[in-house]
């Protein structure tokens, strides 16, 4: 039975050109994490394998950095990065757990409307 739960950073609103950290945390299970995949829509961004370490997809190498931890850092954000991001935890013996984060990247003119917020 899958007892674990995924906690995420929560949805994030960021400004064009900035950088953000996407993180997920698997709790309430003793299952062993064998691999974590980070995906955007249908694209694989990165893999963190327990034995082999990190692999960043070639098309994202310039703007995606591994970590901290099992998280992912996205740099030089563009409006095109707006969308849904998935952390997919492959575990043994539980199976797969998935977390979802919505990242919204705003032009500075739009972001200024929320100036009282911490905009990464």
């Amino acid at each position: 039975m899958m007892t674990g739960t995924i906690e995420t950073t929560g949805n994030i609103s960021a400004e064009k050109g900035g950088s953000i950290i996407l993180q997920c945390h698997l709790s309430s299970t003793t299952a062993q994490v064998t691999q974590v995949n980070w995906e955007q829509q249908d694209q694989l961004l990165a893999i963190c394998n327990a034995d082999l370490g990190w692999h960043i997809s070639p098309s994202f190498k310039d703007r995606v950095a591994p970590g901290p931890g099992l998280g992912l850092t996205l740099q030089s954000l563009t409006v095109n990065d707006t969308g849904e991001y998935f952390c997919i935890y492959h575990t043994y013996p539980d199976g797969t757990y998935t977390g979802r984060i919505f990242l919204e990247v705003l032009e500075s003119s739009v972001a200024e409307h929320g100036a009282r917020f911490q905009i990464p």
Partner: antibody, heavy 118, light 112 residues
Framework: EVQLQQSGPELVKPGASMKISCKAS????????MNWVKQSHGKNLEWIGL????????SYNQKFKGKATLTVDKSSSTAYMELLSLTSEDSAVYYC???????????WGQGTLVTVSA | DVVVTQTPLSLPVSFGDQVSISCRSS???????????LSWYLHKPGQSPQLLIY???NRFSGVPDRFSGSGSGTDFTLKISTIKPEDLGLYYC?????????FGAGTKLELK
């Protein structure tokens, strides 16, 4: 002036599909996500999903995955929501709403009443 | 999904009253950057919902200062200091921090 103009009321048969439009004006269409909200029984509000007009990226409430499909036409600044395989449970008022996470849903369309009946 | 519990569901008022509506979430609405995406709406019959408050406590443009929002973490409040006829309707809170976005069940502000 920001405006979201939705298509008119629809009476559709069970099993059919239909598409609601939401024409945006008075702002940069690609600069804001477009959300869709369902209001049933005159009270409950449910978030269906959103679409980023800039790149077409979507995020759905899992409850509406397979029921609603969100698209945009950038050339006409129009967002669309297609509702599939309609049943009486889908009878409701549907709203489009312009929003950001920061400001919430600042502007709403006037709503489209969908009635599913044989 | 994050459950948003709104209380009370019904609130009978007289004009001039001060009222509070509560919104509680099943998990914290602060994201990892300390931002909390919590907004309040008024929905009047025959109209579209209108944004009152965003980011817990920021009044949207044109919203009278008798409306105020407060709270943090999982506990949020909308206060209306002096009820006027145009304030009657359904009030909703919405959390935008976690997917899917979720609304409270609504509070009906009606005359006693």
């Amino acid at each position: 002036e920001v405006q979201l103009q939705q298509s008119g009321p629809e009476l559709v048969k069970p099993g059919a599909s239909m598409k609601i439009s939401c024409k945006a004006s008075g702002f940069s269409f690609t600069g804001y996500t477009m959300n869709w909200v369902k209001q049933s029984h005159g009270k409950n509000l449910e978030w269906i999903g959103l679409i980023n007009p800039y790149n077409g990226a979507t995020s759905y409430n899992q409850k509406f995955k397979g029921k609603a499909t969100l698209t945009v036409d950038k050339s006409s600044s129009t967002a669309y929501m297609e509702l599939l395989s309609l049943t009486s449970e889908d009878s409701a008022v549907y709203y489009c709403a312009r929003g950001t996470l920061i400001t919430g849903f600042a502007y709403w369309g006037q709503g489209t009443l969908v009635t599913v009946s044989a | 999904d994050v459950v948003v519990t709104q209380t009370p569901l019904s609130l009978p008022v007289s004009f001039g009253d001060q009222v509070s509506i509560s919104c509680r979430s099943s998990q914290s609405l602060a994201n990892s950057y300390g931002n909390t995406y919590l907004s309040w709406y008024l929905h009047k019959p025959g109209q579209s919902p209108q944004l009152l408050i965003y980011g817990i406590s920021n009044r949207f443009s044109g919203v009278p200062d008798r409306f105020s929002g407060s709270g943090s973490g999982t506990d949020f409040t909308l206060k209306i200091s002096t009820i006027k006829p145009e304030d009657l309707g359904l009030y909703y809170c919405l959390q935008g921090t976690h997917l899917p976005l979720t609304f409270g069940a609504g509070t009906k502000l009606e005359l006693k």
